[in-house]
């Protein structure tokens, strides 16, 4: 039976790597079998030499060398962009057009945005070598070399972020010549070599100077979550402080923070975090729904200065970011017992004030919900007839109910003395398993 063309396999975006040909695939159905033709930036390809394109019998387009770039359709386009390919499949009943596939060529420019600079660091202190790689397509990755060899990154001591190399604690062995290398499929580029010298801390002068430092912690502000970090990031705050006293002897600043305990209670131990700033910095990894105390401490080498004043900040509660665990349904005498385990502590996002339990529609229970207050983690529901019972449970903080658990179901049979809950001993029934059983 005759049918109009339909594209089955669309061409995909590709990077022209060379030296071999690039292939663009296009497959179509239809009766009579459709003929395939290709277009580049909306213009049909001639396929006649010296055109570098060649059509295979199965409709695949071979590109033997990059096409000459015509006029850019989007202003002064990048030289990476070779154009957009589409395929058309036609028979006497009509024409189908594929999605566009962009062909680009790998490029790595030569100019670094930021070159690493020579520097002197102090044993035990942090230091940063900055590097901004050249523009490249695909986007280049950055690696660091020391004294002509790839730098072996040690977790907790080395961090590469946005191209820059952060050394948490300088050691004498870190002395040497560093180079940032940008790499992509077009090749690699080396930055200038930066000489890093490591000095021993001069402790004999620093403590006296540091004792005279005064730090005023002025502001602690809750930061808006970065959308790139997903829907439920841990909270972070921005600390701002002012330094007075001798001419900036501190080489680094540390945040000290702890959760506030009830008045008169034993204070929690202070956690410490090295700050990446001299007047303000971000501090992350906190927990929602907690009251925090913050202070800042200056240091230089092994010497520490006096702590700043303490500022308090209450982080708002959020809804729990994980459901209750191990939800089970057990039959009772004319009742069904629902029990569960609270979500993991790191997902509480505040104080769990109770739980919400829902029965799902299309079962023997009408749609309903119950609220369980406090720390109780079970609920007894009266049952009046045989059939299926399905529930979901969610933890509740001051901000509301969090993520609900997956539905768990229980099938009560006629006589009510036998209840099926564990098909082939694989745990509670899911709604899907139950539907399948009821269909059978």
């Amino acid at each position: 039976q005759d049918s109009p063309p339909q594209i089955l396999v669309h061409p995909q975006d590709q990077l022209f790597q060379g030296p071999g040909p690039a292939r663009m695939s296009c497959q179509a159905s239809g009766q009579p079998p459709p003929t395939i033709r290709w277009l580049l930036n909306g213009q049909p390809l001639s396929m006649v030499p010296p055109d570098p394109h060649h059509l295979l019998p199965d409709g695949t387009l071979l590109l033997l060398q990059p096409p000459a770039r015509g006029h850019a359709h989007d202003g002064q386009a990048l030289s990476t962009d070779l154009g957009v390919y589409t395929c058309e499949a036609s028979n006497r009943l009509g024409t189908a057009v594929s999605r566009g596939a962009r062909l680009s060529v790998a490029v790595l420019r030569e100019d670094f945005q930021i070159q690493p600079r020579d520097m002197v660091a102090v044993v035990g202190e942090q230091f940063t070598l900055e590097c901004g790689p050249p523009w490249g397509h695909p986007e280049p990755t950055v690696s660091w070399w020391k004294d002509g060899k790839p730098l072996a990154l040690q977790p907790g001591r080395h961090t590469v972020s946005g191209g820059s190399l952060l050394m948490a604690r300088a050691e004498k062995s870190d002395e040497g010549t560093y180079m940032c290398v940008a790499t992509n499929s077009a090749g690699h580029r080396e930055s200038r070599a930066a000489r890093v010298s490591i000095q021993e801390p001069q402790d004999y002068t620093e403590p006296v100077e540091l004792l005279a430092v005064r730090i005023q912690l002025e502001n602690v502000t809750l930061l808006n979550p970065d959308p790139a970090e997903g829907p439920k990031p841990r909270p972070a705050v921005w600390l701002s402080w002012k330094v007075s006293g001798p001419a900036a002897p501190a080489q680094s600043y540390t945040a000290l923070f702890r959760t506030q305990t009830a008045p008169g209670g034993q204070g929690a131990p202070w956690a410490e975090e090295l700050l990446a700033g001299w007047q303000s910095a971000e501090l992350g990894g906190l927990h929602w729904g907690q009251d925090y105390e913050f202070k800042v401490r200056p240091s230089s080498g092994r010497a520490r200065g006096p702590d700043s004043n303490v500022l308090l900040l209450r982080l708002p509660e959020k809804v729990p970011s994980a459901p209750p665990q191990e939800v089970t349904l057990k039959p009772g005498n004319g009742t069904v017992f629902v029990s569960w385990v609270p979500p993991p502590a790191e997902n509480h996002n505040g104080i769990i004030r109770g739980y919400q339990v829902w029965s799902l529609g299309n079962t023997s229970l009408p749609p309903a919900n119950w609220t369980v207050v406090g720390e109780q983690t079970q609920l007894e529901i009266a049952t009046h007839m045989p059939g299926s019972y399905c529930v979901q449970v969610a933890a509740v903080t001051g901000a509301g109910a969090g993520e609900p658990s997956r539905p768990v179901c229980l099938l009560l049979e006629q006589a009510m003395e036998r209840a099926t809950q564990e098909p082939s001993e694989h745990g509670p029934w899911t709604l899907e398993q139950l539907r399948a059983t009821l269909k059978r």
Epitope: D74, G75, Q76, A77, L78, T80, D81, R102, S104, R109, E110, D111, Q113, I114, Q115, G132, P133, P134, W135, H137, P138, E139, T141, G162, G163, R192, A228
Partner: antibody, heavy 118, light 112 residues
Framework: EVQLVESGGGLVQPGGSLRLSCAAS????????MSWVRQAPGKGLEWVAT????????YYPDSVKGRFTISRDNAKNTLYLQMNSLRAEDTAVYYC???????????WGQGTLVTVSS | DIVMTQSPLSLPVTLGEPASISCRSS???????????LNWYLQKPGQSPQLLIY???NRFSGVPDRFSGSGSGTDFTLKISRVEAEDVGVYYC?????????FGPGTKVDIK
């Protein structure tokens, strides 16, 4: 036709936060680096931030470093500027602009006004 | 940071006459690879800036050929061979050789 449309500007108190967006169309957003440039009322232009096409590399002047964060969502063809700890001197029209490599800003949006005042 | 200065800061011009704007940088804009990234923009009244010249002397697409750029090292010039009424506005130079990128203070061009 290349189009850049900024949004999210408005009045905010000192110390507050604001997030600007720039919706891009008419070009393959994911292959271009992007920048924010601002202009205080009656004053000249000041570069604020640049982000590489994949979002891995970001650059700022000292005047905003640590307070502003440039980011992008290539799936949504959108550029962002998260501005925290705002000060009166951040009051300006904020433009987003497309970069050719890291060589020059070729197309600019119409701008969005941010006013920081108590 | 590199400081960009422009002169004059105000330039009254006569229609049909030539005009010239100077831009100076506090240090050379030539990088390790001998590349130079100096661009010129025009901001017409009530509009966004528009690119005129990129990389010292390259005219952007659609820019009339009465605009030309030249210079090297620390001294750069934008020339308009015959000023037209639509050329009024503020002209800015911008260096993107070294981070942080910096603009000149602008030269206001208006008709005498």
């Amino acid at each position: 036709e290349v189009q850049l449309v900024e949004s999210g500007g408005g009045l905010v108190q000192p110390g507050g936060s604001l997030r600007l967006s720039c919706a891009a169309s008419g070009f393959t957003f994911s292959t271009y680096a992007m920048s924010w440039v601002r202009q205080a009322p009656g004053k000249g232009l000041e570069w604020v931030a640049t982000i590489s096409q994949g979002g891995t590399y970001t650059y700022y002047p000292d005047s905003v470093k640590g307070r502003f964060t440039i980011s992008r969502d290539n799936a949504k063809n959108t550029l962002y500027l998260q501005m925290n700890s705002l000060r009166a001197e951040d009051t300006a029209v904020y433009y987003c602009a497309r970069l050719i490599y890291y060589d020059y800003l070729d197309y600019w949006g119409q701008g969005t006004l941010v006013t920081v005042s108590s | 940071d590199i400081v960009m200065t422009q002169s004059p800061l105000s330039l009254p011009v006569t229609l049909g006459e030539p005009a010239s704007i100077s831009c100076r940088s506090s240090q050379s804009l030539e990088n390790e690879n001998k590349n130079l990234y100096l661009n010129w923009y025009l901001q017409k009244p009530g509009q966004s800036p528009q690119l005129l010249i990129y990389r010292v002397s390259n005219r952007f697409s659609g820019v009339p050929d009465r605009f030309s750029g030249s210079g090297s090292g620390t001294d750069f010039t934008l020339k308009i061979s015959r000023v037209e009424a639509e050329d009024v506005g503020v002209y800015y130079c911008l260096q993107v050789t070294h981070v942080p990128w910096t603009f000149g203070p602008g030269t206001k061009v208006d008709i005498k």
